[in-house]
Interface confidence: medium
Amino acid sequence: PRSIDVKYIGVKSAYVSYDVQKRTIYLNITNTLNITNNNYYSVEVENITAQVQFSKTVIGKARLNNITIIGPLDMKQIDYTVPTVIAEEMSYMYDFCTLISIKVHNIVLMMQVTVTTTYFGHSEQISQERYQYVDCGRNTTYQLGQSEYLNVLQPQQ
């Protein structure tokens, strides 16, 4: 068998809401994956499990089952959404994310995703980890790859 390539493309969108009383942030983060089947037979993407970490704490998990079948030498782009909650001991972030005097409220999140594929009864897992910027201050749609965390973002001069 040839490889099945999983490429984490980045955050597609992040939709934010707040609970003022609980000082809690709810972020629905939609991510994009490219899965390439380099084989001459079809492969089933059985499930995708994802989790999001902020400051080494898991703030959201998601699992998608029976997702799709990828034909021979084909590639499919798959979007998946992870609902996250920033609360309790991290409620100090509420103040940062709702501070109106700055426009961009970027936080760095670690995106972890595991894709399970099956073919001829054989199962294979491929995992990826990537740090991404997400704006916790407003609803944002990103150009693919735009949210990638490479180094500390330099402010506009």
């Epitope: 100090y92 103040d95 940062f96 501070l99 109106i100 005097s101 700055i102 426009k103 961009v104 970027n106 407003r138 973002l153 402010p155 506009q156 001069q157």
Partner: antibody
Amino acid sequence: QVQLQQPGAELVKPGTSVKLSCKASGSTFTNYWMHWVMQRPGQGLEWIGNIDPSDSDTHYNQKFKDRAKLTVDKSSSTAYMQLSGLTSEDSAVYYCARSRGGYYDYGEAMDYWGQGTSVTVSS
Amino acid sequence: DIVMTQAAPSVPVTPGESVSISCRSSKSLLHTNGNTYLFWFIQRPGQSPHLLIYRKSNLASGVPDRFSGSGSGTAFTLRISRVEAEDVGVYYCMQHLEYPFTFGSGTKLEIK
């Protein structure tokens, strides 16, 4: 040298609308929020709203939300405020002012102001 | 909306003396990041407002150090020492912690 240029005066009829301009020079237009502030004769200052020229993100004072529309023309570094449904109550001086945007906290915010446009609503 | 109150419509002062102008907010303007989101402006007769103080106590560029700002989360004071004739005008406080930004009604500085 930073400058915010506004026309001196506008005379308009009740029920019509007016579009006020504020031309910025001396700094990068898209790095600064543009605010609009109203001052009726002999009265205090009232914040109308602001706009981020980089992406036209706006915030309005609810009091003006239905009648004020803030826009920008990046090519000419000009901010506009259109005020519709004018009445005599809208006779006032309208100022534009800028403050740092983007990743910065508003340090010395609203540190430059235009000279103001005096709007008179009269038939 | 946050209400900004300047109780004194005017304050008379003799040139060379000191004067304090007060302002109160209906909600604390102190953010957990340590910044207090309060400005002080002067509007001289026939002119546009001019920034004096930002974040409660920071002197804006070009403002003489005769001006100083202080206060807590809800009670603020602008102090002018050695008042000069050019200090005449209306002084406004303004909050920018929350939208909509709101101004105090203004305090007029008058020379005795």
